[in-house]
């Protein structure tokens, strides 16, 4: 069986401050078993923008039906979006366990943050 | 095996309209992005439109957008595209393929469905 | 925009790769048509998989925005348009097409 991939399809995404971003993220497997989060940056200092399993993200909606057992697709909906909110974000998945490892990450998607149009 | 048989291609004069079917079988049709994609004659290809597996999220190509609509209907594992205000650079062959894991990877597509515009 | 080569040529049983580069893809797929009209068939899908009626000659690799379709024992009947898809809807998702020649 293929090796599970995370599947980050939009190298950058550019939105106007106000609006949504749409952040894509898919999973080629069910395999292993464990949640998505998604970060901005990459390293010690990345900042959790969603956790599948846990947490309060009041602007972070998912795509789809992320609880489906048989779900694939991890794409998030971040609402409101500012200059501050401009990075790369990364899809992660990880191998549940205690606690859950980190297995494999999407190849990440820019978002930058244009004037809010007069 | 995966089958997609598209139908209803012909031939239209500018500014009228043409449906186009597909029909789709070997696979569960409704888990699937399904995707249009032409080839104008001795031309590359071109994505159309893309459809999501409810059916309730739509795509379309700068070229189309406004005068395609796609659709589907699940219960009759069928996929369509309503094409208006048709142009003679809509002259194509309309190919039906099956997304996989991200809509804009394509595992299947169909033998096409020729459209001309011309007056 | 992808860029790709517009031909390319190969030795039959030699090694060919057709490379695609540009867009605002972190994927890539890649598809072969025979002939003008004729249904294109997908060689590989999301950088490196193939699907399972593929031979294995047929592989795919992708770093960083280029992504190569390589074709190792080049045969007679492999002599088509290849295309090149990204993963991104702003990229139009389709290359111009290479049309590879087999000597």
């Known amino acids: 069986e293929e090796e599970l991939q995370v599947i980050q399809p939009d190298k950058s995404v550019s939105v106007a401050a106000g609006e949504s971003a749409i952040l894509h993220c898919t999973v080629t497997s069910l395999i292993p078993v464990g949640p998505i989060q998604w970060f901005r940056g990459a390293g010690p200092a990345r900042e959790l923008i969603y956790n599948q399993k846990e947490g309060h993200f009041p602007r972070v909606t998912t795509v789809s039906e992320s609880t489906k057992r048989e779900n694939m697709d991890f794409s998030i909906s971040i609402s409101n979006i500012t200059p501050a909110d401009a990075g790369t974000y990364y899809c992660v998945k990880f191998r549940k366990g205690s606690p859950d490892t980190e297995f494999k990450s999407g190849a990440g998607t820019e978002l930058s943050v244009r004037a809010k149009p007069s | 095996d995966v089958q997609l048989v598209e139908s209803g291609g012909g031939v239209v004069r500018p500014g009228e309209s043409l449906r186009l079917s597909c029909e789709a079988s070997?696979?569960?049709?409704?888990?699937?992005?399904m995707t249009w994609v032409r080839q104008a004659p001795g031309e590359g290809l071109e994505w159309v439109s893309t459809i999501s597996d409810t059916g309730d999220t739509a795509y379309y190509a700068d070229s189309v957008k406004g005068r395609f609509t796609i659709s589907r209907d699940n219960s009759k594992n069928s996929l369509y595209l309503q094409m208006n205000s048709l142009r003679a650079d809509d002259t194509a062959i309309y190919y039906c393929?099956?997304?996989?894991?991200?809509?804009?990877?394509?595992?299947?597509w169909g033998l096409g469905t020729l459209v001309t515009v011309s007056s | 925009a992808l860029t790709q080569p517009a031909s390319v040529s190969a030795n039959l049983g030699g090694t060919v790769e057709i490379t695609c580069s540009g867009g605002?893809?972190?994927?890539y797929g890649w598809y072969q048509q025979k002939s003008p009209g004729s249904a294109p068939v997908t060689l590989i899908?999301?950088?490196?998989n193939r699907p399972s009626n593929i031979p294995s000659r047929f592989s795919g690799s992708t770093s960083g925005s280029t992504t190569t379709l390589t074709i190792t024992g080049v045969q007679a009947e492999d002599e088509a348009v290849y295309y090149c898809?990204?993963?991104?809807?702003?990229?139009?998702?389709f290359g111009a097409g290479t049309t590879l020649t087999v000597l």
């Open positions: 898809g990204g993963s991104s809807t702003g990229d139009g998702i």
């Open positions: 070997g696979f569960t049709f409704r888990n699937y992005y």
């Open positions: 899908y999301a950088d490196t």
């Open positions: 393929a099956k997304s996989w894991i991200w809509w804009t990877f394509f595992d299947y």
């Open positions: 605002n893809s972190n994927h």
